[in-house]
Every structure is written in C-alpha cells, then in structure tokens.
C-alpha cells in the first residue's frame, strides 16, 4: 500500500482568468505542441484541490497596474504529487501557471532529480491567452515507463531573473523485482562451506528471496532481500539460482554453476621444439585445470637408451609458458619425457611419454702428444698427434682442425687446415721464414669442434739453418716451448 503525506492547502488569491479544467470550450490554445500518443492513465495522488496555487517558490511581480494595485504572486498550481504505475505503462503529468500578459517570452523547463531534461523527452507546453493573463500548461509524457524513470520531477520558469519552481511530482515505477546482486559462479573445494549472495529491489517492497539448488528450493521460508545462503559443502557440481518475489510477481536470477575443484587432467601434445647435444626444448598443451589455476609443472626425464641406467631426472617449472628447456643431458642419447602439472588440489597424471634424442656432441678431449718439426729440405712443417680418447656420446670422429699461427716482426697470421679422420699426421707449408709457428689441433665430429690442444711453438729460421729436434706438447705446468733450430 502506498502511504502519501498530503500537504495542507494554504489559501492564495486566485489569478483572474480561466484555469486548466475550467477552460471554456471555445478557447483554443495559442500554441499547442503535440505530445506522444498511446500513454495509459496511471494512479495519481493530488496533494491539494485542483486550481489552487502551490506553496513552493513564488515570484512577487514588481510591476503595478495603472491603478497601482500590486499584482498577485506567481506560483505553479498544485497538481498530482505522487504517481504509482507499473513498468511499461504510459504516464502523463503536468504543471500549470497563470502569468500576467505583461511578461513576455516565458518558458517552462522540466527537471528530474536536480537535472534538466533535454532533448528526446515528450514535453509539451500549451499557452491559453486571455485579456490580462496567459494560462500555461506544461505536460510531460512517457509512453512506456522503466525503472530508470523513477524520480522527482519539477517544472521551472524564469521571470524577471526570478525562478519559479513547482512542487515535485514523484513517479514511482513498480514492477517485478530487479536484481542488484546475483549469485556468481564459483569453484570450491569439496566439502568446504561457501556463501552465495542474492539481492533484489522493488518497488514495490518488500522483496523476498527463495534459493534454488538443482531445481529444488533450498529454504522453506523466504528471506528478506538481501539474502546470503551458506552452503555447508558440496561433493559434486551443482547449479544455484534465487527467486525474488514481491507483490508484482517473481523474477528468477541466472543459474550459476558451482564446480568442485579437482586434480588437473594430464598435459597433452608434449612435443620437441629443439634438440642440441646437451639440451632439449619441449612444449606441451595443458590439460583441463580441474577448476583451479595451475601452479607449476614437473618435467620427468628418463634415460631411454636401450642400455642406459634409466636414471630419472625431475625438473620443476612454472605452469606458464608451457615451455621448458631440459639441460645437462648427455649427447647422442635417447630420453623419455613426460609432463605433469599441479593445482591447489594436487598433481595431474603424467602426460603420454615421448621419446627425444640429443644430437652428437663435440669432442670433449683434445688430441694428445702433439709434435711439430721442421722438414727444411721440403720447406714443410710436419705435425703428428695421437687420436683423443673419444667418448661414445661425442659421436663419430670426422676429422681434425689444425690452427697454425705465424708470427714475425710484429706480423701475425692464422691459418686453418682440415684433416680427415684416418690421419694422425699432417704437413703444412712454411709460410714465413725467420718466424715462430704456433700449432694447435682439435678433433671434429658432426657435433662440432672439440677443444684445441695446448699450443706447440717452433721457430722457423732463415734459409740455410739445420733441422734437428722436434717440438712437442709441453708437460702440464711447463711454459710453452720455443725450439730454436
């Protein structure tokens, strides 16, 4: 039920001339702006008898007539004070005022909740002139009211820099309950309590709430909005919604799914992005997260060579970016790789294992017993060495790389020679006489070039000197030998 506080009417002298509701039928308006048609009448409460001037803002005219009588104060007449109607209905309400003809260019503006209504509103102002006064009726119509039309409407008129304001007309749009807060989807831990909130408003109030779980009502008695439902815990997924009831009917919220957090599904599509001698870059597609964000992942690497120990290495990494570089692997080896990821509940099963291989490595040891001597008769430098003890992982030896640097009188020149795998000796032409030649040798596989041997130096004299002893790789800790021949 609507309770309306009615104002007491205060007597004011009536303006001369006709007023709305008592216009003669032969009076036609000077100006009539058509209003939108199709509205339906609504329930209206009028605080006073029609035709009385209101008690709001009043302008006292300063002008006096020929007889020097003061003009009565200007004020909007009382009209309906409170309109209650249902959503989507039409409504029309108005303000009226009688203005002495001595005032020109009077305009009436409509305001709602302190803001002027401009533009696309159906506001019509009609003027009914008489000998001394003009009756002005300002109408405002809304063809299909919405909740946003709720509020306090007033008319304003400016005369002589004075503002005349009408009493407010309260529009109350009633309808089905409107949700201001609906329950939200949640992911919850099994058998753990959680809360859902539902809030709806009228008018009309009060709004009562019923909770629904999987199509069945949870509470026998309604709760006044807002309502908080405490669910003691779930063991399986459930759908919750709430019903909001008022005198106009009921509105049902969206149904929200409450999921039970679980361990994730295993990752899928583990794939090899890149492989080197000692590392493998993998990527994977995460499985379903079990309604709980992934925290981290574990990469399990198992030696898979047919005759390997089978050692298992476990590398932990962040869940993103679904990419990991596995390091410290043996060259030319096979590995089985699986990925598992965890959320707050626990670890997923391991992905399907994939087989990956590292590539051939570069040799890890330099050639041994490098010996260099000058063969003056052929103007060559002879180099000899022993094949390094290559590990199986180093792959197949494909040859050797010989670096020889020639230094003389401030000039230095480095040359590189490639030698086949079967050799353990090489012959290089003397490049410069009266110079030092520094030789280093490295073993080469398809995996790359291994470390170079310690440098061995030999002095190449000017023509005519005699060749005797070779120069060889120094014992550890000795200075580089320089052999003067």
């Amino acid at each position: 039920a609507i309770t309306e506080a009615r104002e007491e009417a205060k007597p004011y002298p009536l303006f001369p001339g006709p007023f709305p509701g008592s216009l003669q039928t032969d009076h036609t308006p000077l100006l009539s702006l058509p209003h939108a048609s199709g509205y339906q009448p609504a329930l209206m409460f009028s605080p006073t008898q029609p035709g009385r001037p209101h008690t709001g803002n009043v302008a006292i005219p300063q002008v006096t007539s020929v007889e020097s009588k003061p003009l009565p104060p200007l004020a909007f007449k009382h009209t309906v004070g409170h309109i209650i109607l249902s959503e989507h209905k039409g409504v029309k309400f108005n303000c009226s005022i009688s203005v002495p003809n001595i005032y020109q260019d009077t305009t009436i503006s409509w305001w709602k909740d302190g803001k002027e209504l401009l533009g696309a509103h159906h506001a019509i102002t009609q003027f009914y002139p008489d000998d001394e006064v003009t009756a002005i009726i300002a109408s405002f119509s809304i063809t299909s009211v919405q909740r946003s039309d709720n509020g306090s409407y007033i008319c304003k008129m400016k005369i002589n820099n004075e503002e005349i304001v009408s009493d407010p007309i309260y529009i109350e749009v009633q309808g089905l309950p409107h949700f201001t807060k609906q329950p939200e989807s949640m992911n919850v831990t099994r058998n753990t309590a959680f809360n859902l909130t539902c809030q709806a408003v009228g008018p009309p109030e009060p709004v009562n709430i019923f909770w629904v779980q999987n199509s069945s009502r949870v509470n026998e008695q309604p709760e006044k909005s807002p309502s908080v439902l405490t669910v003691p815990g779930l063991t399986e997924m459930a759908v919750f919604s709430c019903e909001a009831h008022n005198d106009k009917g009921l509105t049902v919220s969206k149904g929200v799914q409450i999921n039970i957090k679980a361990i994730p599904s295993p990752p899928t599509e583990v794939s090899i992005r890149n492989s080197t001698a000692h590392s493998i870059l993998i990527s994977w597609v995460p499985g379903f997260d079990g309604y709980s964000p992934f925290r981290n992942c574990s990469i399990q690497v198992k030696e898979a060579d047919p005759l390997s120990n089978g050692s298992v290495m476990i590398f932990n990494t962040s869940a993103l970016p679904h990419l990991y570089q596995i390091k410290q692997l043996q060259a030319l080896a096979n590995y089985s790789i699986g990925v598992s990821c965890m959320n707050e509940i626990g670890w997923s099963a391991v992905s399907p294992w994939i087989l990956a291989s590292t590539t051939e490595g570069a040799p890890s040891v330099a050639p041994l017993n490098v010996t260099v001597f000058l063969n003056e008769s052929s103007d060559n430098v002879d180099i000899r060495w022993m094949k390094p003890p290559t590990k199986q992982q180093d792959g197949e030896l494909v040859g050797y790389r010989i670096s020889h640097v020639w230094q003389s009188a401030g000039i230095s020149k480095e040359l590189l020679e490639e030698v086949g795998q079967n050799g353990s000796r090489a012959r290089i032409s003397v490049q410069v006489h009266n110079a030092t030649c520094t030789v280093r040798i490295a073993a080469v596989t398809r995996g790359g070039v291994g470390p170079f041997s310690d440098p061995v130096k030999i002095f190449i004299p000017a023509h005519g000197w005699v060749d005797y002893a070779p120069s060889s790789t120094p014992a550890p800790g000795n200075a580089d030998p320089v052999l003067i021949i």
């Epitope: 399990q300 198992k302 030696e303 060579d305 047919p306 005759l307 390997s308 120990n309 089978g310 050692s311 298992v312 030319l332 089985s336 699986g338 391991v350 294992w353 003890p389 590990k391 199986q392 792959g395 197949e396």
Partner: antibody, heavy 114, light 107 residues
Amino acid sequence: QVQLQQPGAELVKPGASVKVSCKASGYTFTNYWMHWMKQRPGQGLEWIGRIHPFDSDTNYNEKFTDKATLTVDKSSSTAYMQLSSLTSEDSAVYYCAIGTLIYWGQGTTLTASS
Amino acid sequence: DILLTQSPATLSVTPGETVSLSCRASQSIYKKLHWFQQRSHRSPRLLIKFASDSISGIPSRFTGSGSGTDYTLSINSVKPEDEAIYYCLQGYSTPLTFGAGTKLELK
C-alpha cells in the same frame, strides 16, 4: 651393495604359467631399468625386455611379446616376469639385470616338464 | 634387428699371450657396444661399455676399441681365470642383441 636376488629353480608343468621374481636392494629401485635375459643350456643370451619401475614403462623383444609379461611391485622393490603357456622351449636360465647390465641376478633355472 | 657376428667362435691360448676378439655389427652402432664375460655356471659380467670405456673393478688387461660396425676386445697377458665365453652386446636399438659368443680356452 647392489643385489638382485632370484629363486634358484622353478619346476612347472607344460601349459602352465610361472612368475619369476627378482628382489632388488642396495640402490634406488625406481631409478634404473630392469632387464630380463634368457639363456638356454649351452646357448647364447637373448634379451626378453625391460621395465622401468618409476612408471612401469616397458619395452619387449617382439619375439617374447606373447610369452612374457613384466611387472614391478615398488613397495617391495621386486620385479616380476610372468611366462605363460610354457613348453620345453621355455626351459632355460632367466636372468634379471639392471641399468647398463653392470649388475645381474644369479639366474633362475626354469624347467618345463610333466 | 641388429645382428652381431663374433669371431672366432673358439680361441685356444697359452697363459701370458695377448688375444683379440672381434665383433661385427650389421649396421653402425655408434660405439654402443658392450663386452661381457661369462664363466661356467655364472652370471655374465660387464667388462667394457661403449666400446672402450673401462669398468671399475675390471682388470686393466681388458681393453676395448672400435667404432661404426667393427669392434675388438683385447686381453693382454691372458690369465687362467680368463677362461670363459665372451659376448658382445649392442645397445644402439631395441631389441638388444648379443653376439653368439667367443669361447676362450686355455691350453
């Protein structure tokens, strides 16, 4: 020290099945492949297959796919090889060995005879 | 399957001699070749892994060499306790395959 304990002998009837065990100790059971080999009297060695106790991953010699089934029991650090539908051809010494085959069991002599 | 051919099938030597046992693979096995010794009524024992890597506890007179398809086990100064059958094994691909063995006899 690393030990792989196998029963010395098993006598079974043709057509039956047998489960040969290999109990491991002295190392981390789940960190090494367990291999099984067959050696018939006066003959060479044959590789049957391997199992990884970490995840029960297996590889079999195709020749033994329908004959042997490899399993492990992590709780007791024991590997098993089940041989089915036994015939006299299955009479042999069966060895378990780990990793790079650096450690071997003593072997189980299986005799399939009625 | 990779076939391993061992030669000779039998070798008769005098203690103190040096012997070489050969193992040839039907394809390159990239040094993934291992040598075992099996004495009479005993389990096999790993002597050399990856063609030439020595094994802790194995006498230094046992050495291995080779790459690609051809591999050799050498026993320097043979001792009486070296009388056994020697097997090579490829660990390059599954199934693992053993050679037929070389029987080393002492005169």
